[in-house]
């Protein structure tokens, strides 16, 4: 199988001279590193910082959003060290990490007024942030956390780099004070639980601080990495020396404290994935272990399991795991070894990001009972790393996506079996950011991210599909890189869509090429299910053909059938006329099949013979619509585009199309008749049709009431013509 | 940037008093309070009182309350820590200080910023 590659779809989108100017003022301090990553939530924001300065742009247009240089309390600026989106009361912000000579400043920044209002002096240098919680009270909102943690309002998970873990409370239900990052409130630590919380924070709070809760008292060990599993209610915490620590925040206990297969290397990053429907109550997190720029070159992804007594669906429709049974290392997989065939010795290997993407089956889709817990039908983690390999100028990114459904189903290899490279994996799929790479340098990457939402498989070749469908590989999404000096977005597609671009540029020469367009489209599981066991040479050019048609019409690929025919009717090369005759004739031929399998699947509609339709048949009836749909769109185009042909061609022709297109809407209407629960037509319909579907009455009365009440609204303005 | 300049301790008999000044500049009082702090000979840094942001509230440790008593004048940008009854374990060097990290004992974990400290004894 072949190489995955990005392709750039924009240019470069370079941040204002403003910000670059701000970020480059601090640069040339030794401090000073530029950072820069996309923050997590759904705003479309990106955080930069250099130094004392933040910049915040849109994520996609790289446009400022907002800007603060932070000041601090001497001569020496402070420095952004950490950066988290948090949302509190209708308001964006960010929750920022300050180092100074002297400790370190958690500020609350305002993104719509871009500036700090809230902040707090604390122990060491704080080394991540990340939010529990951004409300507070004794409410059902809250109840999954520590009575003691209920008291407060908004929450904070702060670590430092000897090892100190807090809980600190924002105060979010005091913002009274107009503070910002040199006036910063002090700040209490309590070590124990104290059974007395709202006493004692009333009291704190009375002195101008704020409370907070150790959890870990200074070890001496750097905290690498953090990150609250909302859906387990543990807070993750990596340590410099490779231990990973799970901490419940129901019942502030550490549940999980071991060391990674890496050893004493850092765990830079966590994440979070689900698998669709595991009955033992069985999530999953990942554990980046990276060295990133210092010694050594260490890069490896540890998936732990993590098996749960209960999982439940809170009133908010949230999912909770709880009753923590074991936690143990299932999957490893190093990105620096010879994991993958590279060309010369790598240096230096660093992860860019890693994020987890879910998306949940539409609710008509569901057959669970209405209070049971979802499962995420699609749950990938797409890792992005960097290798720089001595003596070459520009270094290799690669992103690599892991489909949790399909390790399953590959029978949870606990790392990738021998022979067996990223690129031809069935659970993990890696594609090149060359192109990427040549477009941005000499721009260093900051930060990678996938749109969750462009994250799709396409349409499935045929009913079932393929098992090829299934693999990761057949993913398309976009994505958008971070750089020093703006963004770039840039478009990863799977085998299948790659293969029908290839087929799709191929163009008039098809005919040489449809032994390798054959051969492409197999491997990339676009043919039916019965050509997978037939070699390829036991089949005509005429046979492979049609396969490929097939798959061009089943994926919806039209471009692809047009864009032939355009070409063979305005360039007239030698094939021409036979190839366009060749496929008029598959076309229409595929009509007529298309529409007796239609027909053979309605007749349980109108005979009386059943009271409902399955989904399966439902579905073979939208396809055989989808079908009809695509054939008549080439028809149209054979109609439209015809030129120099007979009379009798023409309405031949013209019937044709015709003809297709009233069969179309025959089947659009079925399938509307069939939504509509007037089909299929059962004994006694005659009864239930005694009435009207619409309540013609009531919806008058509706729509006069909205009427009035906009009329009443614009105060005599709205023309409800 | 902040400055904070401490003046006023010397020596004194137990029981008398003593009056403790902070010159701060770089500073809006009505954003943040200011704390005193003490370091007795051979110990760790202890909060002794604060001064909150609104001005008319004041915070005390048990040890010194109702003996201590800090004000401030906005027009001199000062700070003040009036000390009557002062005992034998008043002695030490006094901070003013801004951005504390204390825990529940009132043991001063970490300060952000303080002046270069006055000192106080306390001897017959």
């Known amino acids: 199988m072949r190489d995955l590659r990005a392709q750039v779809t924009s240019g470069l989108l370079p941040f204002p001279e403003v910000t670059l100017q701000a970020l480059g003022e601090d640069e040339i301090t030794l401090e000073s590193v530029l950072r820069g990553k996309f923050a997590a939530g759904k705003n479309g924001l990106a955080c930069l910082a250099c130094g004392p300065q933040l910049e915040v742009v849109n994520s996609i247009t790289g446009e400022r959003l907002s800007a603060y240089r932070f000041s601090g309390v001497n001569e020496q600026p402070p420095v952004v060290l950490a950066v988290k989106e948090f949302s509190w009361q209708k308001r964006t912000g960010l929750l920022i990490g300050l180092e100074e000579t002297e400790g370190s400043v958690l500020c609350l920044y305002d993104l719509g007024i871009s500036k700090v209002v809230k902040a707090v002096v604390l122990p060491g240098r704080v080394t991540a942030i990340e939010p529990i919680i951004n409300h507070g009270g004794a409410s059902a909102s809250t109840q999954h956390l520590h009575p003691s943690l209920r008291w407060l309002f908004g929450v904070a998970a702060v670590v430092t780099d000897v090892g100190q873990i807090l809980l600190v409370d924002l105060c979010l239900d005091d913002l009274s004070c107009n503070q910002n990052e040199v006036e910063a409130s002090d700040l209490e630590v309590l070590t124990g639980i104290p059974a007395e919380v709202p006493h004692i924070r009333e009291s704190v709070m009375r002195q101008g601080r704020h409370l907070c809760f150790q959890l870990v008292s200074p070890t001496g060990t750097a905290v690498s990495t953090l990150s609250y599993i909302s859906r387990t209610n543990q807070l993750a915490v990596g340590f410099s020396d490779g231990y990973l620590a799970l901490w419940n925040m129901k019942s502030m206990k550490r549940e999980y404290y071991i060391q990674l297969e890496s050893g004493q290397v850092p765990v830079y990053a966590v994440t979070f994935q689900e698998p669709e429907n595991d009955p033992r109550n069985c999530c999953y997190l990942w554990a980046v272990q990276s060295t990133q720029d210092s010694e050594g070159d260490v890069l490896s992804l540890h998936l732990l399991q993590l098996a749960f007594g209960n999982r439940k669906c809170l009133a908010s429709g949230q999912i909770l795991y709880e009753g923590l049974e074991y936690c143990e290392e299932r999957y490893t997989l190093d990105l620096t070894g010879g994991m993958f065939p590279l060309r010369g010795q790598t240096s230096n290997t660093k992860l860019l990001g890693c994020q987890s993407i879910e998306k949940f089956r539409s609710h008509g889709d569901r057959e669970e009972g209405v209070n049971e817990a979802l499962s995420p039908d699609t749950s990938v983690s797409v890792f992005t790393w960097q290798v720089n390999i001595y003596g070459q100028g520009k270094p290799s990114v690669y992103l690599g996506l892991f489909d949790i459904n399909r390790w399953y189903h590959a029978q949870m290899p606990d790392s990738l079996r021998s022979g067996e490279y990223l690129h031809n994996c069935s659970y993990f799929a890696l594609w090149s950011l060359e192109s990427v790479v040549s477009r941005t340098s000499p721009h260093g990457i900051l930060d990678i991210l996938v749109h969750e939402r462009s994250l799709n498989r396409g349409v499935p070749p045929s009913y079932p599909p393929p098992e090829q469908f299934f693999n990761p590989s057949t993913y398309n999404f976009d994505a958008t890189c971070l750089l020093n000096s703006g963004v770039v977005h840039l478009t990863c597609t799977g085998f299948q869509k790659e293969t029908l671009t290839f087929l799709k540029k191929s163009g008039p020469s098809l005919n040489e090429l449809i032994p390798d367009g054959y051969n492409r489209c197999l491997v990339a599981g676009l043919l039916s299910p019965r050509f997978v066991d037939v070699q390829p040479s036991s089949l005509s050019q005429e046979e492979q053909l049609e396969a490929i048609l097939s798959a061009a019409i089943q994926t919806s690929s039209l471009g692809l059938l047009t864009g032939y025919i355009r070409r063979w009717i305005t360039e007239e090369q030698p094939n021409s006329a036979t190839n366009l005759r060749f496929v008029l004739e598959w076309t229409w031929n595929k009509v007529v099949l298309t529409k007796e399998e239609f027909d053979r699947l309605c007749v349980p509609l109108f005979d009386g013979s059943c009271h409902f339709m399955d989904p399966q048949t439902i579905q073979s009836i939208q396809q055989c619509y989808l079908l009809l749909s695509n054939l008549n769109i080439v028809l149209s185009c054979f109609a439209s585009e015809a030129r120099e042909i007979t009379e009798r061609g023409l309405i031949d022709l013209s019937n044709k199309f015709v003809v297709s297109h009233l069969i179309c809407q025959y089947a659009q209407v079925v399938l509307w008749f069939s939504h509509s629960g007037l089909l299929p037509e059962g004994i006694d319909d005659s009864v239930q049709l005694s009435r009207l579907c619409y309540n013609y009455p009531v919806i008058q009365n509706y729509y006069t009431s909205r009427r009035q009440k906009f009329e009443r609204l614009s105060r005599g303005k709205w023309n409800p013509d | 940037q902040v400055q904070l300049v401490e003046s006023g301790g010397g020596l004194v008999q137990p029981g008398g008093s003593l009056r403790l000044s902070c010159a701060y500049s770089?500073?809006?009082?009505?954003?943040?309070?200011l704390s005193w702090i003490r370091q007795p000979p051979g110990r760790g840094l202890e909060w002794v009182s604060k001064?909150?942001?609104?001005?008319?509230?004041?915070a005390y440790a048990d040890s010194v309350k109702g003996r201590f008593t800090v004000s401030r004048d906005n027009a001199k940008n000062t700070v003040y820590l009036q000390m009557n009854d002062l005992q034998f374990e008043d002695t030490a060097l006094y901070y003013c200080a801004l951005g504390l990290v204390q825990d529940s004992q009132g043991v001063v974990l970490s300060v952000r910023a303080r002046g270069q400290g006055t000192q106080v004894t306390v001897s017959s």
């Open positions: 001064i909150l942001n609104n001005g008319s509230n004041a």
């Open positions: 770089g500073l809006d009082l009505s954003r943040v309070g």
